[in-house]
Amino acid sequence: HTAAQDNCTCPTNKMTVCSPDGPGGRCQCRALGSGMAVDCSTLTSKCLLLKARMSAPKNARTLVRPSEHALVDNDGLYDPDCDPEGRFKARQCNQTSVCWCVNSVGVRRTDKGDLSLRCDELVRTHHILIDLRHRPTAGAFNHSDLDAELRRLFRERYRLHPKFVAAVHYEQPTIQIELRQNTSQKAAGDVDIGDAAYYFERDIKGESLFQGRGGLDLRVRGEPLQVERTLIYYLDEIPPKFSMKRLT
């Protein structure tokens, strides 16, 4: 099994309980909250991680302007319903029977309704814009070095295929990382950009999801890159459906 066999832990997800009692006595790790078996050789889905978190005892511009359809996660934490593969179910409801539709990263994309609300399909978030502001430094980072370091981070730490890191923009002190992944581009075994973005977000906040690893120590040519603000925008393959009332 892909959980560390010697001491039976899950390197990629500390929100698990691991025991050497899977099939054939192999190490098996289950996500807290849901109890779903997870593959510890890759990132755990954001839906299972959120569920585990809820169960735990909480001018000339080079920068991208988020589209009018971009979503920001204003609703924050909730206890999601995940499907048998660990993905978000298209419709989420709370304990008081208030329901809403979400995209593949679990962000609300419709007005809230009641139990009669229909969410026909899980709409894929195909473009994620991670907007960071770094703390003041002696000088600006070299753009190429910054680009290379962030691409290396997503490739090595989050196992995201380099082709899904579409661009890294820099205009001191703002850094923007663009992740793009269409349904047709994502092959079996590929890390989802939504999961990579969530792991990155938690790392930046000093809440690493990796087992036993130190926190994220981002350096560009030896100079620490310390983030003081993060904003993440999500763009879906089908634009969200909010009433005009919300947009005003």
């Epitope: 309980v17 025991s19 050497p20 009692d21 899977g22 099939p23 098996q28 289950r30 807290l32 909250g33 849901s34 109890g35 779903m36 078996a37 499907d83 048998p84 593969e85």
Partner: antibody, heavy 117, light 107 residues
């Protein structure tokens, strides 16, 4: 060989709590989940919850969250389930099972709990 | 919670016959299904794990199949000692759940 020993019967007054035991032997107690299952007379099996003895992590079927409390004593390789404020609905056979987090390969003989004044 | 529906509630067969028990899950659970036999006043006994994997010490006449939502336990030549209740159980996610059971009777 693996054994899970449970007392045969417990008589409890309504409202009084009862602590059911399950003593494990023949394997490394801390490495394997202990599951608890309820069976009312003539009825099917109902999963109450489980506990991982190594770190005492517990899960409960929502239906039993307020009445059952699972604990372990690693020093004696014993798992416990406390039933609080039992009613006649809690009169049943309670099984502990272990060894796998998936299929439950080993079972105790079950404890018949009778709630009666 | 994942609901497991077993059918039929009672099966009546003659010794030597082949018999099949059905278990249907309310959602896709891969092969995370396990089958148990429980004789009168006894503890359940694991017969098959992960839909089709045999268990040491269980007679070879017991076999399992299926994946996703539909699962089957088969006894290819029933013996009188097989009179019991048969339950399926899922381990895809917590809370684990059991089917309602099927009672096997011998004609």
């Amino acid at each position: 060989q693996v054994q899970l020993q449970q007392p045969g019967a417990e008589l409890v007054r309504p409202g009084a709590s009862v602590n059911l035991s399950c003593k494990a032997s023949g394997y490394t107690f801390t490495s394997y989940w202990i599951n608890w299952v309820k069976q009312r007379p003539g009825q099917g099996l109902e999963w109450i919850g489980n506990i991982y003895p190594s770190n005492s992590y517990t899960n409960y079927n929502q239906k039993f969250k307020d009445t059952a409390t699972l604990t372990v004593d690693k020093s004696s390789s014993t798992a416990y389930m406390q039933l609080s404020s039992p009613t006649s609905e809690d009169s049943a056979v309670y099984f502990c099972s272990s060894y796998r987090s998936d299929g439950f390969a080993y079972w105790g003989q079950g404890t018949l709990v009778t709630v009666s004044a | 919670d994942i609901l497991l529906t077993q059918s039929p509630a009672i099966l009546s067969v003659s010794p030597g016959e082949k018999v099949s028990f059905s278990c249907r899950a309310s959602q896709n659970i891969g092969t995370s299904i396990h089958w148990y036999q429980q004789r009168t006043n006894g503890s359940p006994r694991l017969l098959i794990e992960f839909a089709s994997e045999s268990i040491s010490g269980i007679p070879s006449r017991f076999s399992g199949s299926g994946s996703g939502t539909d699962f089957t336990l088969t006894i290819n030549s029933v013996e009188s000692e097989d009179i019991a209740d048969y339950y399926c159980q899922q381990s895809n996610s917590w809370p684990f759940t059991f089917g309602g059971g099927t009672k096997l009777e011998i004609k």
